[in-house]
Interface confidence: low
C-alpha cells in the first residue's frame, strides 16, 4: 500500500516521499496526465502504468500492503500473493528509477501545478 | 473463447493422494491467477489457494498449507492441484477459476469422493 | 482474515418483488464482488468491484455499498433469479466468501 511506497521511497532515496515526490512533476502524486516533465517524473509515468496493469487484475493498490527487505541499498520482495508480491515490484521498480534520477531532481518541479501539465 | 476444463471424478481410499487438473484454453495461460475452490455438499465455497503459472508463485490459505499443493505447465496451459493425507473432510467438489479481475471463468469443477 | 456475513440465509420472493441481498464484512474492504450459483453448476461472476455487471447479467440487478456494508439488490425478482448468491472479498488474504443467501421463488 501507499505506507510500504513511502518507507521504500525513503530508505531508497534518503529524501522525504511525501515533500519531494508526492506532487512533482506531472504524474508523481495522485492523477497523472500530458507529458512527464523530467527523469523523476518519467519514472512516475511508468509506475502509474505499472499500478494500472495491476488494477485490471483486480488488485488493490491503495490497500493492500506487502513485505519487503531491505538491506545494503538493495530491496527485496517478500514471496506472497500475486498482489502483493507485483505490487512491491512496481514500487521498488520506481524507487529504483528515482535514486537513478536523483542528480537530475528539479526543485521547480516539486510542486508543479497539474494545470499546466498537457 | 476461454474454457478451464477440469479431469474426471476421483474415489480414493483415506490416507492417499489425489492430482487433479485444470486446462486452460482461449487465453494466454500465464497472464492470469488461477484459484482453486472448494465446495462440500451443500455447503458454501472456500478458497483454497492461487497460483500466477507466469512465475510459478503460490499463495495458500493456512487451512491447507500441507493438504494442498498448486504446480503449473506452462507447456501445456495446465493447472494442477494434489491433495494430500485424504480423509472424508476432504470429500468435496473442487473447482478451478481464472482471477481478471474476478472470477471470471470457473471450471465445471472435480468430485473427489474420499472412502475405503 | 476477514468474515463475510450474508443476511438472510434463505428467503423466497414473488415474481416482480424487490429483493435485497446484504454481506456485512468483519473489517472495512475496498470492493465486494457477487457469484450467482445453481445446483450442479459452476458459481458465476455476476457483480464485481462492488457495482459492476459481469457480462451477460440482466440490468435489473445492481450492487452497491462500502467500507463494510454491501448489499445485492434485484428490482424485480423472475423465475431465473432463484439461486444461491455469495459475496466475496479481494481485499486481503485469505479470499473468503459469504455463507450463501439461497434465493426461492415464491
Known amino acids: 500500500g501507499l505506507l510500504d511506497l513511502k518507507s521504500m521511497i525513503e530508505k531508497v532515496t534518503g529524501k522525504n516521499a511525501l515533500t519531494n515526490y508526492g506532487f512533482y512533476g506531472c504524474y508523481c502524486g495522485w492523477g497523472g496526465r500530458g507529458t512527464p516533465k523530467d527523469g523523476t517524473d518519467w519514472c512516475c509515468w511508468a509506475h502509474d502504468h505499472c499500478y494500472g496493469r495491476l488494477e485490471e487484475k483486480g488488485c488493490n493498490i491503495r490497500t493492500q500492503s506487502y513485505k519487503y527487505r531491505f538491506a545494503w541499498g538493495v530491496v527485496t520482495c517478500e514471496p506472497g500473493p500475486f498482489c502483493h508480491v507485483n505490487l512491491c515490484a512496481c514500487d521498488r521498480k520506481l524507487v529504483y528509477c528515482l535514486k537513478r534520477n536523483l542528480r537530475s531532481y528539479n526543485p521547480q518541479y516539486q510542486y508543479f501545478p497539474n494545470i499546466l501539465c498537457s | 473463447q476461454v474454457q478451464l476444463q477440469q479431469s474426471g471424478p476421483e474415489l480414493v481410499k483415506p490416507g492417499a493422494s489425489v492430482k487433479m487438473s485444470c486446462k486452460a484454453s482461449g487465453y494466454t495461460f500465464t497472464d492470469y491467477v488461477i484459484t482453486w475452490v472448494k465446495q462440500r455438499t451443500g455447503q458454501g465455497l472456500e478458497w483454497i489457494g492461487e497460483?500466477?503459472?507466469?512465475?510459478?508463485?503460490?499463495y495458500y490459505d493456512e487451512k491447507f498449507k500441507g493438504k494442498a499443493t498448486l504446480t503449473a505447465d506452462k507447456s501445456s496451459n495446465t493447472a494442477y492441484m494434489q491433495l494430500s493425507s485424504m480423509t472424508s473432510e476432504d470429500s468435496a467438489v473442487y473447482f478451478c477459476?481464472?482471477?481478471?479481475?474476478?472470477?471470471?471463468?470457473w471450471g465445471q469443477g472435480t468430485t473427489l469422493t474420499v472412502s475405503s | 482474515q476477514i468474515v463475510l456475513t450474508q443476511s438472510p440465509a434463505i428467503m423466497s420472493a414473488s415474481p416482480g418483488e424487490k429483493v435485497t441481498i446484504s454481506c456485512s464484512a468483519s473489517s472495512s474492504v475496498s470492493y465486494m464482488y457477487w457469484y450467482q450459483q445453481k445446483p450442479g453448476s459452476s458459481p458465476k461472476p455476476w457483480i464485481y468491484r462492488t457495482s459492476n455487471l459481469a457480462s451477460g447479467v440482466p440490468a435489473r440487478f445492481s450492487g452497491s455499498g462500502s467500507g463494510t456494508s454491501y448489499s445485492l439488490t434485484i428490482s424485480s425478482m423472475e423465475a431465473e433469479d432463484a439461486a444461491t448468491y455469495y459475496c466475496?472479498?479481494?481485499?486481503?488474504?485469505?479470499?473468503?466468501f459469504g455463507a450463501g443467501t439461497k434465493l426461492e421463488l415464491k
Open positions: 497460483i500466477y503459472p507466469g512465475s510459478g508463485s503460490t
Open positions: 466475496q472479498q479481494y481485499h486481503s488474504y485469505p479470499l473468503t
Open positions: 477459476a481464472r482471477w481478471f479481475p474476478y472470477f471470471d471463468y
